[in-house]
Amino acid sequence: APTSSSTKKTQLQLEHLLLDLQMILNGINNYKNPKLTRMLTFKFYMPKKATELKHLQCLEEELKPLEEVLNLAQSKNFHLRPRDLISNINVIVLELKGSETTFMCEYADETATIVEFLNRWITFCQSIISTLT
């Protein structure tokens, strides 16, 4: 059974992931972002189901396309280079979902823009955090 310290650690990691995703969203989804229309042409694959930490596998698999989009953005929008930002997210995702269990991600038929994609994973983080508190 998860201890209170492991639950607290999970909560902190989720909060960190949430902040990173929100920072990316805020950095790109505003009219001052001159690359927004180009970023919206990139297609993202959404999870069919995202209710447990193991479903973060679906986010992990889309981190490469996410980095590609962020490479279009101007660096002033973020405090880190896209490669470093994605690397940080990847570390958190790996710790949260656990590397010992292999989970095959199932994707929904509908694809999404980067804005829809980020909003979906932000909602996921908020939902899991609410169950832990």
Partner: antibody, heavy 119, light 108 residues
Framework: EVQLVESGGGLVQPGRSLRLSCAAS????????MHWVRQAPGKGLEWVAD????????YYADSVKGRFTISRDNSKTTLYLQMNSLRPEDTAVYYC????????????WGQGTLVTVSS | SYELTQPPSVSVSPGQTARITCSGD??????AYWYQQKAGQAPVLVIY???KRPSGIPETLSGSSSGTTATLTISGAQEEDEADYYC???????????FGGGTKLTVL
């Protein structure tokens, strides 16, 4: 109501220059990227160039790179296309167009201005 | 340079379904957009982000995408659907926009 009105087209000799304008109204011009698209007589659409909302990013089709320059004046809500070293194959109707809201599709188009390059 | 490939023409009987395809290597990772252009008029956006319809576009026009092919479907085609249809997307870098060669839809 969104309106895009192109002007500046006409007959020009090969090697000469021409500047097209696109006057925009009915939306917050400085929020949106703008595109130029052309269509040669009886042919398909060809993307020419686009410019970001603040003018900091410009992209060009290979066919016009180094000869055409896209620019904008947000205070005048006007888009420009400076065309130098014109060739007969640049003969086309030139449209300005813009994505609107949160999509990258070109929602609004002008009616176009005809550029004829001939001696 | 990146290319999007469309059939030059598609013919359909009134009331039937027409499908216009658009092929491009980047389409698994990039959205497709579709424009309708009637003779002497400016193009009109009819589908964006593979399958979304702008307001005012009838439900008879729909879009889909699978792998390297995007498809525009015109259900119950009528004479007023006769037009040139163009797909539009970006290359792998997301830097350059490209139109397909266009497809002339004829409703016989």
């Amino acid at each position: 109501e969104v309106q895009l009105v192109e002007s500046g087209g006409g007959l020009v000799q090969p090697g000469r220059s021409l500047r097209l304008s696109c006057a925009a109204s009915g939306f917050t011009f400085s929020y949106y990227g703008m595109h130029w698209v052309r269509q040669a007589p009886g042919k398909g659409l060809e993307w020419v160039a686009d410019i970001s909302n603040d003018g900091s990013n410009k992209y060009y089709a290979d066919s016009v790179k180094g000869r055409f320059t896209i620019s904008r004046d947000n205070s005048k809500t006007t888009l420009y296309l400076q065309m130098n070293s014109l060739r007969p194959e640049d003969t086309a109707v030139y449209y300005c167009a813009t994505p609107y809201y949160d999509s990258s599709g070109l929602d609004y188009w002008g009616q176009g201005t005809l550029v004829t390059v001939s001696s | 340079s990146y290319e999007l490939t469309q059939p030059p023409s598609v013919s359909v009987s009134p009331g039937q379904t027409a499908r216009i395809t658009c092929s491009g290597d980047a389409l698994p990772k990039r959205f497709a957009y579709w424009y309708q252009q009637k003779a002497g008029q400016a193009p009109v956006l009819v589908i964006y982000e593979d399958n979304k319809r702008p307001s005012g576009i009838p439900e008879t026009l729909s879009g889909s995408s699978s792998g390297t092919t995007a498809t525009l479907t015109i259900s119950g085609a009528q004479e007023e659907d006769e037009a040139d249809y163009y797909c539009y997307s970006t290359d792998n870098t997301g830097g350059l926009w490209v139109f397909g060669g266009g497809t002339k839809l004829t409703v016989l």
